[in-house]
């Protein structure tokens, strides 16, 4: 069966790690050094990706799979397959064309990447601000002001503290 199929399309028999070599009457040839083919039936092997500069090697290239890169410390991946490395900033900052800049008042960023986002507007949900926001953290919304009116609280008030030196009556 294999021989019959190979007479129809000899390249279809070439497994991953090889290519269909036109210079050799279309026989399957192993990929040359530093190249790969991850699927069968390929007419060429692809050159291995090299992780250089700000990229570092996460997985070495083999004859059947490409190298995989990530970014050196202080940078993070962007794009499919980590096609770019972008500089990290500190929490509370965002990356601009001029470098890392602090988040403007009313915005925050809790990661080393991405942009500063506006604090949550608690009043839109009818709630109040329980904890103020910072450059690094969003605000924490609490119960609505109505929930804080006397008698509306579901929280049991703490027992009054006993005075020292007195035993219970």
């Amino acid at each position: 069966f294999e021989r019959t199929r190979s007479l129809q399309d000899p390249c279809s028999n070439c497994p991953a790690g090889t290519f269909c070599d036109n210079n050799r009457n279309q026989i399957c040839s192993p990929c040359p050094p530093n190249s790969f083919s991850s699927a069968g039936g390929q007419r060429t092997c692809d050159i291995c990706r090299q992780c250089k500069g700000v990229f570092r090697t996460r997985k070495e290239c083999s004859s059947t799979s490409n190298a995989e890169c990530d970014c050196t410390p202080g940078f993070h991946c962007l794009g499919a397959g980590c096609s770019m490395c972008e500089q990290d900033c500190k929490q509370g900052q965002e990356l601009t064309k001029k470098g890392c800049k602090d988040c403007c008042f009313g915005t925050f960023n809790d990661q080393k990447r991405g942009i500063c986002r506006p604090w949550t507007n608690c009043s839109l949900d009818g709630k109040s601000v329980l904890v103020n926001g910072t450059k690094e953290r969003d605000v924490v919304c609490g119960p609505s002001p109505a929930d804080l009116s006397p008698g509306a609280s579901s929280v049991t008030p703490p027992a009054p503290a006993r005075e020292p030196g007195h035993s219970p009556q």
């Epitope: 790690g17 070495e60 004859s63």
Partner: nanobody, 111 residues
Framework: AVQLVESGGGLVQPGGSLRLSCAAS????????IAWYRQGPGKQRELVAW???????HYVDSAKGRFAIWRDNTKKTTYLQMNSLKLEDTDVYYC?????WGQGTQVTVSS
């Protein structure tokens, strides 16, 4: 250039075993990829097994589980151990690296 010389072929009964050898001489620094092929009369040369540039052994489906390829760098020799041989394994087997080919060794499986 690299010179390759195969040996170890012969006549064997179905189910038997053979070990082919491929001895290299010359500039063997280029021997990062080495492969065994087979060819019958009037047929296309077919890949059987190879050691890739990353030193991993690979096999075509018909050889998986029956054949084993490895190399002994001290002896500049690559081997193809062929087990559970079948009638359809009968062919001339060639060793190859880059543009260098051996002269071939005949393997005949017959009862």
């Amino acid at each position: 250039a690299v010179q390759l010389v195969e040996s170890g072929g012969g006549l064997v009964q179905p189910g038997g075993s053979l070990r082919l050898s491929c001895a290299a001489s010359g500039n063997i620094s280029s021997l990062r990829v080495i492969a065994w092929y087979r060819q019958g009369p009037g047929k296309q040369r077919e890949l059987v097994a190879w050691i890739a540039w990353d030193d991993i052994a690979h096999y075509v489906d018909s050889a998986k589980g029956r054949f084993a390829i490895w190399r002994d760098n001290t002896k500049k020799t690559t081997y193809l151990q062929m087990n559970s041989l079948k009638l359809e394994d009968t062919d001339v087997y060639y060793c190859n690296s880059g543009d260098s080919w051996g002269q071939g060794t005949q393997v005949t499986v017959s009862s």
